[in-house]
């Protein structure tokens, strides 16, 4: 049980005046005082591995990662970054400590990652791990959390690799369905990264920072619940971690759980079991199946079996790239003025989408609900019976999806009229799109019943206002008509609306507005 070398890891921030990629040196620069990075031996690790606290660096900042080694004799070293070896030149300070430095000038995203320093001394070999990440408001990210088993104990760590570092919370619920909604009294929140109580019905982990909140649910098969009519499906991208929990309750401890992938037992080390007695002295067992980084061959049917319950399965599908599956054909709807109606998009997506509903250049919040068949649905009901074009847009980092909807509100026309020196125009927005008549009011026809057969030009649906179709009709004025009153009427299946105009008038003259239903 020898005395280990005393290792000190520090971060030195520099005032910038040059630029380069990582250099392993003692490059002279104007520097701030060193910051300790809490380098410590990683407990229970194979070999001697020291770990430094994560370093957060602003874009374009220059830093030095430095290790001071209090060990007798010479040392040799090697830096490894992203599988590339970098030159390492140790030197000794006035206190005869070995000093190894890695200079990162003008930090960029490509220089972020894990820097490994391998040191060999006369007495021992060891590794020092530095994790360098970028802190920059332009590079703020919020990544969906994922789970990892805590080393040497039955607990899950929730990790979200986001910038700025998010606040992580577990959202736990022991009820079923609707009562597990976010603000329900049945929901318990724990603002911590590690969760030991893994027996709950519904377990989610959420991460939040300046960009919002992202959550991941622990995928669970409950052998005491009636299986869904469709097989539950879990999508993952290559390289992501897989976690499935199988849960079962029985009157006593005399039962066991097992996981199989395509009828083959999972390998040792890719599952772990926990059990506890519940308040009514029944035994709860949970068995986790996990893969730290999935590959295509991890796709398949994962079946949880029990000696006392019917087995249940889930289909795990590993994809190279995320997707959004939905029909993108545009849809038209016509509804009555007081009819209740919601737009609806049914989709299957992985990772979970972020979405918006847009109308009249205004974005509305988008809610999505998971369905039992593996699909999700987003509904939009807040249209306030305004006709026009509504757009659903979804994206998830790998895929984008847009769907257009047109909403028409059945109502009788409403006419707007205006006149210029040479013509009179009427427009209407009723639906179905109206037809037009023009009548002349004269001594012969005081009720304005005399048709004007010529000079009328109808433009149906020529103007689109945020998706709302407008029909217009124009009367070209002849000299003989000047000084007369004319009436334009728009009619559809729901009614008629008219506007009377005095020709030769410079503007609209709503002398009489008739409404004949």
């Amino acid at each position: 049980n020898q005395d280990l070398p005393v290792i000190k890891c520090v971060l030195i921030n520099h005032k910038n005046n040059d630029s380069s990629v990582g250099k392993s040196s003692s490059y002279p620069m104007v520097s701030e005082s060193p910051e300790d990075l809490g380098c410590a031996l990683r407990p229970q690790s194979a070999g001697t591995v020291y770990e430094a606290a994560t370093v957060e660096v602003d874009v374009s900042a220059s830093i030095t990662l430095q290790v001071l080694v209090d060990t007798p004799g010479n040392i040799s070293c090697l830096w490894v970054f992203k599988h590339s070896s970098l030159n390492c030149q140790p030197h000794f300070d006035v206190q005869n400590r070995g000093v190894v430095s890695m200079v990162i000038l003008k930090m960029t995203e490509t220089q972020a990652g894990e820097y490994l320093l391998f040191i060999q001394s006369e007495a021992t070999n060891y590794t020092i791990v530095f994790t360098v990440s970028i802190r920059n408001t332009l590079l703020f990210t919020l990544r969906r959390p994922y789970f990892r088993k805590m080393e040497n104990q039955d607990a899950l760590v929730c990790i979200s690799e986001s910038v700025p570092e998010p606040i992580v919370e577990w959202v736990l619920c022991d009820s079923q369905g609707e009562s597990c909604k976010e603000e329900s009294p049945a929901v318990v929140k724990k603002e911590e990264k590690v969760l030991h109580e893994l027996f709950g019905t519904d377990i989610r982990c959420c991460a939040r920072n300046e960009l919002g909140r992202e959550c991941t649910r622990l995928f669970t098969i409950d052998l005491n619940q009636t299986p869904q009519t469709t097989l539950p499906q879990l999508f993952l991208k290559v390289g992501e971690p897989l976690w499935i929990r199988c849960k079962a309750v029985h009157v006593n401890h005399g039962f066991g759980l097992t996981w199989e992938l395509e009828n083959k037992a999972l390998e040792e080390g890719s599952y772990f079991e926990m059990s506890t007695y519940s308040t009514n002295r029944t035994m709860i067992r949970i068995l986790f199946a996990f893969v730290s980084s999935v590959a295509r061959n991890d796709t398949g049917y994962y079946t949880c079996s029990s000696s006392k319950h019917p087995s249940q399965s889930a289909l795990v599908t590993i994809v190279e790239k995320g997707f959004i599956n939905a029909t993108n054909s545009s849809e038209d709807y016509e509804i009555d003025q007081y009819e209740e109606f919601c737009f609806s998009v049914r989709f299957k997506a992985y990772p979970q989408i972020r979405c918006t509903w847009t109308f009249s250049r205004k974005a509305f919040p988008c809610e999505q609900k998971a369905l039992d068949d593996g699909y999700s649905v987003s509904k939009f009901c807040n249209h306030k019976h305004q006709p026009g074009e509504y757009i659903f847009h979804a994206e998830n980092g790998d895929a984008q999806f847009t769907k257009m909807f047109t909403l028409n509100i059945r109502r009788k026309p409403q006419v707007l009229a205006e006149a210029s020196a040479s013509q009179a125009s009427c427009s209407s927005d009723g639906y179905p799109l109206p037809s037009w008549t023009w009548k002349k009011c004269s001594d012969k026809s005081p009720n304005c019943t005399e048709d004007i057969p010529e000079g009328v030009w109808n433009r149906k649906a020529n103007r689109k206002v945020f998706g709302q179709w407008v029909s217009s009709s124009t009367l070209n004025m002849s000299e003989a008509m000047k000084g007369f009153l004319v009436k334009c009427c728009a009619y559809n299946s729901l009614g008629t609306s008219c506007e009377t105009i005095l020709l030769n008038s410079p503007g609209p003259f709503p002398f009489i507005q008739d409404s004949i239903s």
Epitope: G38, P43, A53, T54, E56, S133, N152, I159, E165, V194
Partner: antibody
């Protein structure tokens, strides 16, 4: 050289609020995984953890004292402030601040401590 | 809340001899246990974390063992500067940390 130094009143009256400041140097509280905890020790008794704060503002409190405690970062990034309301003579103790370092999946507990400040609660 | 119980409350050992201090947790804390040494008028000093990993600069005569609920701190050959109070602390359900009541190691 990592140092932590506690400062605050040495004498507090019952029902008053105690405000303690921990000034750190040699490490940064803007570093992603650095945190500071407050721990107290009544004369001749054991240590009791009170609260902690991490550089990302994640904070936590002792369940038995949660309603009385508030931990925050001071105006300077090198300070952590603890306030404890409704002080009582039983709160007489030496109050320490200590550094904590969190890694991705493990934790280094209190590796550096301040020298402590004795707070007496008496009328 | 996890309760940490240390035994004995006081341990009398002669310099050069071996000292064994025990710590028991009311429920499993896995390997997330630390040991601290505190001398009169001083702040505690981290000796061991992860149940068995020595902190930086701690001599090899200090060793920790155990996992789950039973833990031991062993000082193989006591030096005069080792006489102090020793505390165990669990950080398994961090961010909640609890300390034992301490063992006083005195010169026999």
């Amino acid at each position: 050289q990592v140092t932590l130094k506690e400062s605050g009143p040495v004498l507090v009256k019952p029902t008053e609020t105690l405000t303690l400041t921990c000034t750190v140097s040699g490490f940064s509280l803007s570093n992603a995984r650095m945190g500071v905890s407050w721990i107290r020790q009544p004369p001749g008794k054991a240590l009791e953890w009170l609260a902690h704060i991490f550089s990302n503002d994640e904070r936590s409190y002792s369940p038995s004292l949660k309603s009385r405690l508030t931990i925050s970062k001071g105006t300077s990034k090198s300070q952590v402030v603890l306030t404890m309301t409704n002080m009582d003579p039983v709160d007489t103790a030496t109050y320490y601040c200590a550094r904590i370092v969190g890694y991705v999946d493990w934790l280094l507990p209190f590796d550096y401590w301040g020298q402590g400040t004795l707070v007496t609660v008496s009328s | 809340e996890i309760v940490m119980t240390q035994s004995p409350a006081t341990l009398s050992v002669s310099p050069g001899e071996r000292a064994t201090l025990s710590c028991r947790a009311s429920q499993s804390v896995s390997s997330n246990l630390a040991w601290y040494q505190q001398k009169p008028g001083q702040a505690p000093r981290l000796l061991i974390y992860g149940a068995s990993t020595r902190a930086t600069g701690i001599p090899a005569r200090f060793s920790g063992s155990g996992s789950g609920t039973e833990f031991t701190l062993t000082i193989s050959s006591l030096q005069s500067e080792d006489f102090a109070v020793y505390y165990c602390q669990q950080y398994n359900n961090w961010p909640m940390y609890t300390f034992g009541q301490g063992t006083k190691l005195e010169i026999k």
